[in-house]
């Protein structure tokens, strides 16, 4: 058998391997070592009793989509039964006090491995012995500790393989300079020491994407807007857009990055070399934002002029076009750049919003029949922009980190946006207070210490105002959760 | 849609170049290879070559290797063949041909574009 | 280079009949044929790819098959519009070669 007949549907074809030549693989033309490595089909019985105690599964991941010339990488993970792990020797064990359908085992290994290549079954000292190799026959490297590493990983894709020894997880990066654009497939074979031989255990496939666009995310984010992911933003506050560039090989980490920004609303291009821009819009309606990246990333060297043209010779020393699939264009040690460009677009909405809220005065309320620890405070808030439709208020302790109490309540505020919250205190001493004016869209916060005073009639309530943070909250049965927006991880330069 | 549309017909005398463009539209055009296919009066279809328009790499039939050159203009999505020193025998249509991904057969084609060498 | 030997050179099919084609490789290029069908005029337009995968809107009547060194082009019932010149491709490995051609025409 060969390599493509074990690992793929369908034979690839030499034109796949000649266009998609990937450093450090082997093509699957060779031949599959079927004694050493049996090959099982899709459903057969044997499939059943390739791992004590169930099915193991293997999970394959990506960093894709990968630009061209940047390294993608794969990583494959084992997932065992339940109550099953790998241990520092590289053996499966039981986990203790794990508990399965069969009950607690006695038996601590599900394989021991290492009782096994202790039975060093002829080997000549170095190690190598005739079951110690890939499927194709290539011996296995010897590193620190290979003996604990008991799964052979066969990787396929454009009609070439690689064969690495490992634990129960796996990583291998592959160059994308030479391979096609679009959408291609990996696929992942697994196979488990058993004996002098191993026994396939699981297969996996995903798809990847090599790309020449540079992939660009974009967050959005504003103080006082209610939900940051609906595309919808407050007039006359600035938002915050922030690139965000998936290069997980850091492929454009010596580039110079260029945003050019076009907000939509008739303000011109804005070109900048920062990931993070500002941006207020000061009408409301539908705006269309786009924006273009790009960077001088390495990349293919242009072919040199051709030769001027000369009559044909019958000369044998010219190769078939297929020998040198790289052509002229890849010499390698030429460091050539090639410009890439990213695009984001998107839709946004502007409307109207509360931009500001402030608390201008607090006061005491007297109360005629005074409760014996309890305190009435009347907060005077006023606020900008839009008309709120709801007011809440976080009572908590003097580090505004341990919330005692919170409420949330409609409120029905005229044009001047004027309003007076009363709130109830539970015995003396200082709170932070955070209250909130909302509507649809938006949400304002405004935070104050105060201390209430004893209960005696001559103490007087002190009041220290701090200016309206932007907090984003979520209403859940009368319950606030607090969460802050800026908690992305950057692309930086 | 994918289209590949193919300059106009041309009259070459013996020992001259043409060159023939084939312009792109409705793909991402740096991600296929383009072909060029010939087809003499009444014969079969030849494979000439092709060319990556993202890096410009070719790989050319033997019997043209050094004939032919085949160059790409990004800005323009346009892929151009030149065949140099003509004879009769390269009287022909010269078609564009575009391939899927890694797969070199050709669901796109140009219209053809008749080349004449004639004394 | 990868030899195409086409056979027939010509074949005469009546309405409604099957008409076969027959595509031999020098050597083995399975899976990577495809089958072309050629009109006066016309480019070529891909009929099957991968020796038996049918392209998007093509008729269910055409069919390929075969493996190795020997494919088939079958189309089960012959209609009037099929008349051309149906060529195979092998797209296995460079350079691509072309079988020489078979003309379809109504007995």
């Known amino acids: 058998k060969r390599f493509h007949d074990v690992l793929g549907n369908e034979r690839p074809s030499a034109y796949m391997r000649e266009h998609n030549q990937l450093n450090g693989w082997s093509s699957d033309e060779n031949d599959w070592n079927e004694k050493l490595y049996p090959v099982w089909k899709r459903g057969d019985m044997r499939w059943k009793n390739s791992w004590k105690g169930g099915r193991v599964q293997a999970v394959l991941t990506s960093d894709s989509p990968a630009l061209v010339g940047s390294n993608i990488t794969f990583v494959v993970n084992l997932v065992f039964p339940r109550c099953q792990k790998e241990d520092a020797n590289g053996n499966i064990v039981y986990e203790k006090n794990c508990r399965n359908e069969a009950g607690l085992s006695a038996d601590p290994y599900v394989y021991n491995w290492t009782a096994w290549s202790e039975d060093s079954d002829g080997e000549n000292g170095t190690g190598q012995s005739h079951h110690n190799v890939f499927p194709d026959g290539k011996p296995f490297p010897h590193h620190p500790g290979w003996r604990r590493w008991n799964f052979v990983y066969v990787f396929h894709t454009l009609g070439q393989y690689f064969q690495k020894l490992g634990r129960c997880s796996v990583r291998v990066s592959v160059n994308t300079a030479n391979v096609t654009l679009g959408p291609q497939l990996m696929e992942v074979t697994v196979y488990r020491r058993h004996g002098r031989a191993y026994v396939p255990i699981a297969q996996v496939k995903d798809v990847y994407v090599v790309t020449d666009q540079i992939p660009v995310f974009v967050t959005m984010s504003q103080k006082n807007d209610r939900n940051s992911s609906d595309e919808t933003f407050l007039k006359d506050l600035p938002i915050t857009f922030d690139v965000l560039i998936h290069d997980p090989s850091h492929f454009l980490n010596y580039s110079t990055i260029n945003y050019k920004w076009s907000f939509g609303d008739n303000t011109g291009l804005f070109v900048s070399i920062n990931h993070t821009v500002n941006h207020t819009y000061v009408l409301n309606g539908t705006f269309s934002l786009n924006l273009t990246v790009k960077a001088a990333a390495p990349g293919p060297c242009p072919p040199p002029p051709p030769p001027p043209p000369r009559p044909p010779k019958p000369t044998p020393s010219l190769g078939p076009a297929g020998d040198n699939p790289l052509g002229l264009s890849e010499i390698p040690d030429e460091n050539c750049q090639i410009n890439r460009y990213g695009h984001f677009q998107a839709t946004i909405t502007i409307v109207e919003g509360i931009l500001e809220v402030n608390i201008i005065q607090t006061t005491d309320v007297l109360m005629l029949v005074p409760g014996p620890d309890s305190s009435l405070i009347d907060f005077v808030v006023t606020c900008q922009g839009s008309i709120p439709t709801e007011v809440c208020t976080i009572i908590s302790d003097p580090t505004c980190e341990i919330t005692q109490n919170a409420v949330c309540s409609p409120v029905d505020v005229d044009e001047m946006c004027l309003l007076t919250v009363r709130r109830a205190f539970n015995g003396s001493g200082t709170y932070c207070v955070n209250l909130t004016l909302g509507d649809d869209t938006s949400l304002a916060l405004t935070s104050t210490l105060i201390s209430v005073p004893d209960r005696d009639p001559a103490s007087s309530l002190r009041m220290a105002n701090s200016g309206g943070g932007g907090l984003n909250d979520i209403f859940e049965a009368q319950k606030i959760e607090w969460h802050e927006h800026h908690h992305h991880h950057h692309h930086h330069h | 849609q994918v289209q590949l549309v193919q300059s106009g017909a041309e009259v070459k005398k013996p020992g001259a170049s043409v060159k023939v463009s084939c312009k792109a539209s409705?793909?991402?055009?740096?991600?296929?290879?383009m072909h060029w296919v010939r087809q003499a009066p009444g014969q079969g279809l030849e494979w000439m070559g092709e060319?990556?328009?993202?890096?410009?790499?070719?790989n050319y039939a033997q019997k043209f290797q050094g004939r032919v050159t085949m160059t790409v203009d990004k800005s323009t999505s346009t892929v151009y063949m030149e065949l140099s020193s003509l004879r009769s025998e390269d009287t022909a249509v010269y078609y564009c041909?575009?391939?899927?991904?890694?797969?070199?057969?050709?669901?796109?084609w140009g219209q053809g574009t008749l080349v004449t060498v004639s004394s | 280079d990868i030899v195409m030997t086409q056979s027939p050179d010509s074949l005469a099919v009546s309405l409604g009949e099957r008409a076969t084609i027959n595509c031999k490789t020098s050597q083995d290029v399975s899976p990577s044929l495809a089958w072309y069908q050629q009109k006066p005029g016309q480019p070529p337009k891909l009929l099957i790819y991968s020796a038996s995968k049918r392209y998007t809107g093509v008729p269910d009547r055409f069919s390929g098959s075969g493996s190795g060194t020997d494919f088939t082009l079958t189309i089960s019932s012959l209609q009037a519009e099929d008349v051309a010149v149906y060529y195979c491709q092998q797209h296995y490995s460079i350079p691509l070669t072309f079988g020489g051609g078979t003309k379809v025409e109504i007995k």
């Open positions: 409705g793909y991402t055009f740096t991600s296929y290879w």
């Open positions: 060319i990556n328009p993202y890096d410009q790499r070719t």
């Open positions: 041909a575009r391939s899927t991904g890694n797969y070199a057969w050709f669901a796109y």
